[in-house]
Each structure stands twice: as C-alpha cells, then as structure tokens.
C-alpha cells in the first residue's frame, strides 16, 4: 500500500515539477514554511524532472534537492488531506 502511495505521490510530484514555471510558485511554497524543521534554505527555480535518484530526483545542487524534498512534502500533505476528505465524504453517503 505504501509503495502504491509512493508511486502516486511521485507521479503527481513529477507532473507538478514539470509544469512549474516555477521559481515563483516554489518560493511561495517555501515562504509558507514548507522546508524542513531543521533544514532548508530559500527558493530557487525548479527544473524538469528527468533523472531519478532514490525516491527523489537527481540534481547537482544540494539546495535544489532540499527544495524538491520540500515540494514533495507539501504535495504529500495536500494529497493526504484530499484523500482523508474523500474518505470522510464517502462515509457520509
């Protein structure tokens, strides 16, 4: 189940990052406090998701890697809320 969830998240993550035009959007995410509680740095542009590395992506910049993890974390939170909402709504029917 966790693998399926990871798969869905990674797919959504890839689409979002590919669509981001994205310095602005990323910076707004980071400004809203998406970065890690002990890690993080302020925004830079996203790049198309091409090469994969582990669960995340390949990037040569460590700050960009952190930014991408922050976006992924944000998406996980958003998707998680949506999923919980759907389950709630189903329960009401």
């Amino acid at each position: 189940r966790r693998d399926v969830a990871h798969g869905i998240l990674n797919e959504a993550y890839r689409k979002v990052l590919d669509q981001l035009s994205a310095g602005k959007h990323l910076q707004s995410l980071v400004a809203r406090g998406v970065g890690g509680s002990l890690g993080g740095g302020a925004g830079d542009d996203a790049e198309p998701l091409s090469k994969r590395h582990s669960d995340g992506i390949f990037t040569d910049s460590y700050s960009r890697y952190r930014k991408q993890m922050a976006v992924k974390k944000y998406l996980a939170a958003v998707l998680g809320k949506r999923y919980k909402q759907r389950v709630k709504n189903k329960g009401r029917r």
Epitope: L38, D44, K73
Partner: antibody
Framework: EVQLVQSGAEVKKPGSSVKVSCKAS????????MHWVRQAPGQGLEWMGL????????RYAQKFQGRVTITADESTSTAYMELSSLRSEDTAVYYC??????????WGQGTLVTVSS | DIVMTQSPDSLAVSLGERATINCKSS???????????LNWLQQKPGQPPKRLIY???TRESGVPDRFSGSGSGTDFTLTISSLQAEDVAVYYC?????????FGGGTKVEIK
C-alpha cells in the same frame, strides 16, 4: 537542543559489513537531512551520503555508491549507515550530522570502525 | 566533484596575534538561491567537528566574534583576529552547494 548519539566502536574483518546507528533527540527526526561523514586516522573529512527520513530518500557520494546504504527508522528516531565489502582503508571514525541552513550544525560523537584481519 | 584547497596546511601563531586560513574551490559556490554554502569547522583532538561559520560569513551562535569568515565565489578566508590558547585545533572548510559535498584538507593551528 538536538543531540545525536552513535553506537559503539566496532572491529571488523575485511570483506564484511558494518552497520552504525545514530539516535537523534530534541528535534523532528523525520524532517531533517541526516548525513554521514567519515574521518580516517589523522586524515580529513569525507562525505558519504544523506537520508531524508520522511521519504526515505537517499543520496550517496559517488565514491561509496553501491557499497553504502543509509536507512532510517522514524519510530525510534534512528539513522543507520551500513558499509559493505570492508577493506583496511575503511578504518575510520564515522560521524552522523544534521543539516541546518545547508550546513552541518549537529554532530554525533563518532564511531570508530577498525577493519583488520 | 568540487575540489576544496586549503592553505596553509599548518600555522603557528603567537597568542593574541591574527591567524588567517585560506580556502579555494574549483568552482563557484554561489547557489541559484543567492546563498554561498561555504562552511568552516573547528575540530579539537578526540572530538567531533564543530560548526563555526556557515554561508561563508555567518557566525554560529556562541562562537566568539574573534572568528570571522569572508569571501565569495571561489575564494574564502577564515580569520582568528586574536588567537587564544583554546583555538588550537584543525580547521576545515567545506562546501554544501554542490553534490558531492566536499571538504578541504584542513589547517592545523598551533601556538608559536
């Protein structure tokens, strides 16, 4: 205050593996970038890799690719670094370190791994 | 990988005198986010390293103000304005801008 406590010293045979642990306290463990750095006796520092526990996402130094595995157990706030196919040159003190502001702000006390036949 | 070259390898300075350590990177450490991820660590015998300076010039809280970092791009300097006995240690620069993260070879600071 974040604290990192590492497992004790190990003596290993060439060709074997070692697994070093690093237990974190005083912070949100899953939401940190946990790095591993080693230091051979009388030598400088060498970055081995990192893990972001929330997604179990890892990044390894090219030099150690295929030989190092970094994992994390969120339930115990513990990170692990396993190094396989050990050789004498792997004799070193292994440190875990937590990133803050893109720099290693917190360090474990170090774990000496001795590789000897 | 980015090569970090530190100089000198060792340095003997009289108490109260200035100590200067240089660090040169093989590529600019200015990141796309506008920050320069050049860091300085202090390591005393038998101890783990300790962060002194990050972002090239930001002093870690609790670090005495005799320690200062400067530089940009590829050339950086750590200065100890007035050397104290407790400053005897090995100092390392390292870069956190590019993977793989890399360290300088270290500079041993001793009292003359």
């Amino acid at each position: 205050e974040v604290q990192l406590v590492q497992s004790g010293a190990e003596v290993k045979k060439p060709g074997s593996s070692v697994k070093v642990s690093c237990k974190a306290s005083g912070g949100t463990f899953s939401d940190v970038y946990m790095h591993w750095v080693r230091q051979a006796p009388g030598q400088g520092l060498e970055w081995m890799g990192l893990i972001y526990p929330i997604f179990a996402d890892t990044r390894y130094a090219q030099k150690f690719q295929g030989r190092v595995t970094i994992t994390a157990d969120e339930s115990t706030s513990t990170a692990y670094m396993e190094l396989s196919s050990l050789r004498s040159e792997d004799t070193a003190v292994y440190y875990c370190a937590i990133d803050q502001d893109g720099s290693f702000a917190y360090w474990g006390q170090g774990t000496l791994v001795t590789v000897s036949s | 990988d980015i090569v970090m070259t530190q100089s000198p390898d060792s340095l003997a300075v009289s108490l109260g005198e200035r100590a200067t350590i240089n660090c040169k990177s093989s590529q600019s450490l200015l990141d796309a986010d506008g920050k320069t991820y050049l860091n300085w660590l202090q390591q005393k015998p038998g101890q783990p390293p300790k962060r002194l300076i990050y972002w090239a010039s930001t002093r870690e809280s609790g670090v005495p103000d005799r320690f200062s970092g400067s530089g940009s791009g590829t050339d950086f300097t750590l200065t100890i304005s007035s050397l104290q006995a407790e400053d005897v240690a090995v100092y390392y620069c390292w870069q956190g801008t590019w993977f793989d993260l890399t360290f300088g070879g270290g500079t041993k600071v001793e009292i003359k």
